[in-house]
């Protein structure tokens, strides 16, 4: 039947058998990095280029035969998925073969890293149109492996790897946690997190999104005409680079932050069941099946927005977390989340001529994530403005006072261990957009940002008593670019972003007695840019 | 996707001793790392990527593999350059034994080494 | 050499149960979709359901949904056919199909006959 | 559920000469992501499994007699087989796999005259 994974991928307006891709990836070359592959199968034969590159370790064990359908069925069968004739997703993709797994595929960093470096010096031999480099292979955590990807990607190519088979947190492999890295997760038919035998799916912050990767149809390397299905994160990987080479053919002026956004903006939301991944991990690992764009979609007017989760602050009493956006992205917001409650806040700094996110653990408490919303605006200045603790009963406020400059984003951080209960509760006054507001004992940060056309408007949600979640949606056109908690009260145990919406937690009421005057608000700072939209219509 | 902060095994070993009374060996305090898989059946020991610092000249890539060769045979150590990296990163890929490490670690220029280790088709 | 040995049918009351089972050698079993199909004496071929090479996905005719259970032992390389709340309609030879991925059927065993009467 | 409709039920035709069956789905079956039809051609011969002939409406499986050819697009599909032979006597059956419930023609038996 038409494969499910095909149309998993159409865009949710068309019926798969009605989709007919634009271009297909035709201006773009994709590298794949994996074992041989069998380059005259009728489904890849003629837009496979297989290079002379090998660097692979020697096959374990003294009886192993090396059988040529064997050696190159991994490799054949992801040739296949992304620009295969039948059940390719970039049908149009021309592919480059490099050999960096053996027979039994296993390679090793070395090998892979001599890989990158041959595609570097293809590049920068002939440049050529959009790259595409696809790593369907994960190891441990690499730090060379990882600044390797972040040099090719600083170079202008799109790596896209797979998020790892082993049911683990992604961050402990590479180079599915390279930052620069586009790394993606398995899902099946059924929209659940792939379990391959006793594993399955890596998950986790690394992961960008998700796509099919079980039961996918391909070509199989047993003979020239032969299909098999195939599991595993190297498929759902495959997938992506497809759709990233389709992406490019139709705008290849595409940065990789651009492309990123793109991929996870045009994602299905909200539709993976969370359940199969562990507690701690769920508000980590995006909600996101990969789609491709409705064909026609130029989506540059758009303003887009990503959530980035840092690391672990780990527990100590002075122990701080750092979330940061990518090179080309602009962080707009900072918050940050503490599964105890005990953190103090967060707060915008510049490192190394960058904004990033840091966020502040308490005493007693079991540590932090720093959240930052990172948005593709050009031509953005950003800064931030601080309101020292006003210790007044009216709460600490602090607006964007210079001309044209709008409001992205609230944060605060406190010294103080516990911040109590704000009595009487803070209210934002009426009439001033351009205002955060907090607790009388925090500092209030707030991003201000000038950007051609750029506006915001603050849209609030207050529950009178105490619940576990309140959420803020922005509408239709706008998006999402601050997220914030008001105003701030012991039991928030954070507030993030996800997608379009600002969600604030807060301790299980039930558990904690809260009383009814600790009101809870989620602060959501919705954005557009008239600047793009006007030039969207001019395009048209 | 944080890089820095993966959970990966670290040994920073602090050099503060002169070595072989180089005149470029690194300045007093200066630190290289270095770094292996932390699953355990995963690493390849015996193999090692020698990553040089960012600002290093191209240049410095075959001069450093071959200083580091002339002390490990001083030492009565055969070493092996399996490759210069110049296109990615400064620095090379080179066969040697583990007991060289530290000295490795002191030659000028060198930002951290990392052991090699498996990566495996998923 | 690549076969599919099917077993398990017989003679069995209506309302009673079955369990079918289809052996398979020569490929690699997990890599690829199974079907049932059935035929009835005298009549045409008639599919019965499909199970993917993971064994996550199941598809059943309207006819024998809610009563019939398809499943897959990749380590017994065996395909299996649970058959509950047995009818006379349901009398038929039973073959095993491997799929070709597409849904179409590139290798048949030589079936098994399940015949339902009381 | 998609109908598959085959005429004639069943056909006389001398030896060395041309047998065609037709076959037509109640819905398309081309999938036009890869310009595949999505139709297969079987045959059945008394006491024996089916034996895949043709898929994606055209394509012979490996080892299928270059007699058999399969021809047509969306709804309207013909078996041929260019010179009948004496061990071609059996029921033809066409299927969809272009959707679950995957559905096969009623089938069409072939005898010589």
């Known amino acids: 039947s038409i494969p499910w994974n095909l149309e998993r991928i159409t865009p949710a307006r068309y019926r798969a058998d009605e989709y007919q891709p634009p271009k297909g990836g035709s201006l773009v070359e994709v590298y794949l990095l994996d074992t041989g592959i069998q380059s005259d199968h009728r489904e890849i034969e003629g837009r496979v280029m297989v290079t002379d590159f090998e660097s692979v370790p020697e096959e374990d064990g003294t009886r192993f035969h090396r059988q040529a359908s064997k050696c190159d069925s991994h490799g054949t069968h992801l040739a296949g998925v992304v620009s295969g004739r039948d059940a390719g997703v970039a049908k149009g993709a021309g592919l480059r073969s490099l050999r960096v797994l053996n027979c039994q595929g296993k390679g090793t960093v070395s090998g892979t890293l001599i890989g990158l470096e041959f595609i570097r010096k293809s590049q920068l031999v002939q440049p050529v149109g959009p790259l595409v480099v696809l790593l369907p292979l994960a190891g441990g955590y690499s730090r060379v492996f990882n600044a390797a990807c972040q040099r090719l990607a600083r170079a202008g190519v799109v790596l896209v790897t797979a998020a790892g088979n082993f049911r683990d947190d992604a961050c402990l492999y590479s180079p599915a946690s390279a930052p620069e890295v586009i790394t993606v997760g398995a899902t099946n038919a059924q929209d659940q997190p792939v379990t391959l035998g006793t594993l399955g799916t890596n998950f986790g912050r690394c992961v960008d999104l998700f796509a099919p990767g079980e039961d996918i149809i391909g070509a199989s390397s047993d003979c020239s005409t032969c299909f098999v299905s195939r599991s595993g994160t190297s498929q759902a990987a495959a997938h992506v680079a497809g759709i990233a080479a389709m992406m490019l053919s139709a705008e290849p002026e595409l940065t990789l932050a651009e492309l990123r956004q793109r991929l996870i903006h045009f994602s299905a939301k909200d539709v993976i069941n969370e359940a199969w991944f562990p507690e701690d991990q769920r508000v980590l690992t995006p909600n996101l099946v990969a789609a491709l764009p409705p064909s026609t979609h130029r989506a540059g007017w758009q303003l887009f927005c990503r959530t980035v989760w840092s690391a672990h602050s780990g527990p100590t009493r002075m122990a701080t977390a750092v979330a940061r956006c990518a090179q080309d992205e602009e962080l707009l917001s900072c918050s940050s989340f503490s599964r105890s409650g005990k953190r103090r806040g967060e707060r915008i700094e510049a490192q190394g001529g960058k904004r990033v996110c840091r966020a502040h653990n308490a005493f007693g408490g079991e540590g932090v994530y720093a959240i930052a919303r990172c948005c593709l605006l050009p031509q953005v200045n950003c800064s931030v403005h601080t309101a020292p603790p006003a210790g007044a009963s009216m709460g600490t406020r602090v607006h964007c006072h210079q001309q044209g400059h709008v409001l992205t984003g609230c944060s605060s951080h406190w010294e103080v261990e516990d911040l109590g209960t704000h009595k009487p509760p803070v209210l934002r006054p009426r009439g001033q957009p351009n205002q955060c507001v907090g607790h009388r004992e925090a500092s209030i940060h707030a991003s201000c940002c000038h950007a051609p056309g750029l506006e915001c408007k603050v849209k609030e949600h207050g529950i009178p008593a105490p619940q576990e979640q309140v959420i803020v949606a922005c509408e239709d056109g706008w998006t999402l670019t601050g997220c914030s908690a008001l105003p701030g009260t012991s039991h928030v145990l954070g507030a993030y972003a996800v997608d379009n919406t600002c969600v604030v937690r807060s301790w299980d009421v039930s558990t904690t007695g809260s009383t009814s005057e600790e009101a809870v608000a989620a602060v959501a700072i919705c954005c557009r840019s008239r600047h793009l939209v006007q030039a969207s219509q001019e395009l048209q | 996707q944080e890089d820095e902060d993966g959970d990966y095994e670290e040994l920073v070993l602090a050099l503060r001793s002169e070595e072989d009374g180089l005149a470029d060996a690194p300045e007093h305090g200066a630190t290289a790392t270095f770094h292996r898989c932390a699953k355990d059946p995963w690493r390849l020991p015996g193999t090692y990527v020698v990553v040089l610092k960012e600002e290093t000249h191209r240049s410095q890539s075959e001069r450093t593999a071959r200083r580091l060769q002339a002390q490990a045979a001083r030492r009565g150590y055969l070493t092996k350059i399996l490759h210069v990296f110049h296109h990615l990163l400064p620095g090379f890929l080179v066969k040697m034994s583990g007991d060289l490490l530290e000295l490795a670690l002191k030659l000028p220029h060198v930002d951290y080494i990392e052991e090699d280790s498996s990566v495996f088709a998923q | 050499e690549v076969q599919l040995v099917e077993s398990g049918g017989g003679l069995v009351q209506p309302g009673g149960s079955l369990r079918l089972s289809c052996a398979a050698s020569?490929?690699?079993?997990?890599?690829?979709?199974m079907n049932w199909v059935r035929q009835a004496p005298g009549k045409g071929l008639d599919w019965v359901s499909t199970i993917s090479g993971s064994g996550g996905t199941t598809n059943y005719a309207d006819s024998v949904k809610g009563r019939f259970i398809i499943s897959r032992d990749s380590s017994k390389h065996t395909l299996y056919l649970q058959m509950n709340s047995l009818r006379a309609e349901d009398t038929a030879v039973y073959y095993c199909?491997?799929?070709?991925?597409?849904?179409?059927?590139?290798?048949w065993g030589r079936g098994t006959l399940v015949t339902v009467s009381s | 559920d998609i109908v598959m409709t085959q005429s004639p039920d069943s056909l006389a035709v001398s030896l060395g000469e041309r047998a065609t069956i037709n076959c037509k789905s109640s819905q398309s079956v081309l999938y036009r992501s890869n310009n595949r039809n999505f139709l297969g051609w079987y045959q059945q011969k008394p006491g024996q499994p089916p034996n895949l002939l043709i898929y994606?409406?055209?394509t012979r499986e490996s080892g299928v007699p270059d007699r058999f050819s399969g021809s047509g697009s969306g709804t309207d599909f013909t078996l041929t087989i260019s010179s009948l032979q004496a061990e071609d006597v059996a029921v033809y059956y066409c299927?969809?796999?272009?959707?679950?419930?995957?559905?096969f023609g009623q089938g069409t038996k072939l005898e010589i005259k």
């Open positions: 020569g490929f690699t079993f997990n890599n690829y979709a």
């Open positions: 994606w409406a055209s």
């Open positions: 199909a491997k799929d070709s991925n597409w849904g179409n059927f590139d290798l």
């Open positions: 299927q969809q796999y272009y959707t679950t419930p995957y559905t």
